[in-house]
Interface confidence: medium
């Protein structure tokens, strides 16, 4: 059985403050079943950015329809970027359970925020 891969193709993304940032993530397999979550930062201090299953994430939208059968694209778009959004974002696959178990993280995409040109 091929090992699941979580692919974040861009090592870094740079956007101007006020613009939107697209963070790409795909998985190599639909198995095992379980959700994808996005975090900023790693370790215990990481921030939950997007969780399709629950919560309200008003500035984040899924690029593809994550509820669509056989969807393997879990890229997100974050709107109205501010300097406080800078950091490294990780796409993380979980195995469905009670609670869900973290399986694999992408390599991360560093988001840098430029001052908006005046």
């Amino acid at each position: 059985e091929e090992e699941l891969q979580v692919i974040q193709p861009e090592k870094s993304v740079s956007v101007a403050a006020g613009d939107s940032a697209t963070l790409n993530c795909t998985v190599s397999s639909l198995i095992p079943v379980g959700p994808i979550q996005w975090f900023r930062g790693a370790g215990p201090g990481r921030e939950l950015i997007y969780n399709l299953k629950e919560g309200h994430f008003p500035r984040v939208t899924a690029v593809s329809d994550p509820t669509k059968r056989n969807n393997m694209d879990f890229s997100i778009r974050i709107s109205n970027i501010t300097p406080a959004d800078a950091g490294t974002y990780y796409c993380v696959k979980f195995r469905k359970g009670s609670p869900d178990v973290e399986l694999k993280s992408g390599a991360g995409t560093e988001l840098s925020v430029r001052a908006k040109p005046s």
Epitope: R40, R46, E54, T82, K116
Partner: antibody, heavy 119, light 108 residues
Amino acid sequence: DVQLVESGGGVVRPGESLRLSCAASGFSFSSYAMNWVRQAPGEGLEWVSRINSGGGGTDYAESVKGRFTISRDNSENTLYLQMNSLRAEDTAVYYCAKQYDWNGFFDYWGLGALVTVSS
Amino acid sequence: ETVLTQSPATLSVSPGERATLSCRASQTVGSKLAWHQQKPGQAPRLLIYDASRRATGIPDRFSGSGSGTDFTLTISSLQTEDSAVYYCQQYYYWPPYRFGGGTKVEIK
């Protein structure tokens, strides 16, 4: 409906400790960063501390750093503020506030808990 | 650190009249500014976020405008129940989160 209910306030002497709790309901508590904001009598609002959704990331105002500790229990939907080495200037109403998203404003506030530090 | 300065400190307005409150930031905060209302003896309540978006359940007599460093909260036709202190909050740079010093709106 979102509800935030603080408890644990009271009167203490300088140097003593107190722990505030904030019971949350009506939303997915574990998905949101939470904050404590205080208001001294007759004064404005002062942000005190923030904790991220998972509980592993914390920030503090300089005025309380090293004395106050924020924590949360996501299984119990409860936010805490452990206040040690209390000073007269910590006298205030302490509000628990939910954050709209990880980098955002405060969209819901509790009713507040009064902490009085007096000898 | 971003400092928010609110003016005037106190505003006295007759019922039905327009009230205009100002919040100025010491450096740009984009559109990342919220307004909170605090009535005497009560907790704050969110009115406006992202400079101009009304929070759920807020009457349309409240409106926000501005971006960058200069922001305005307007109450188009003041009601007696609008007597309160109004605070602006920036969330462009943090920590710390910063509030303005407040504007007290009194009914004439």
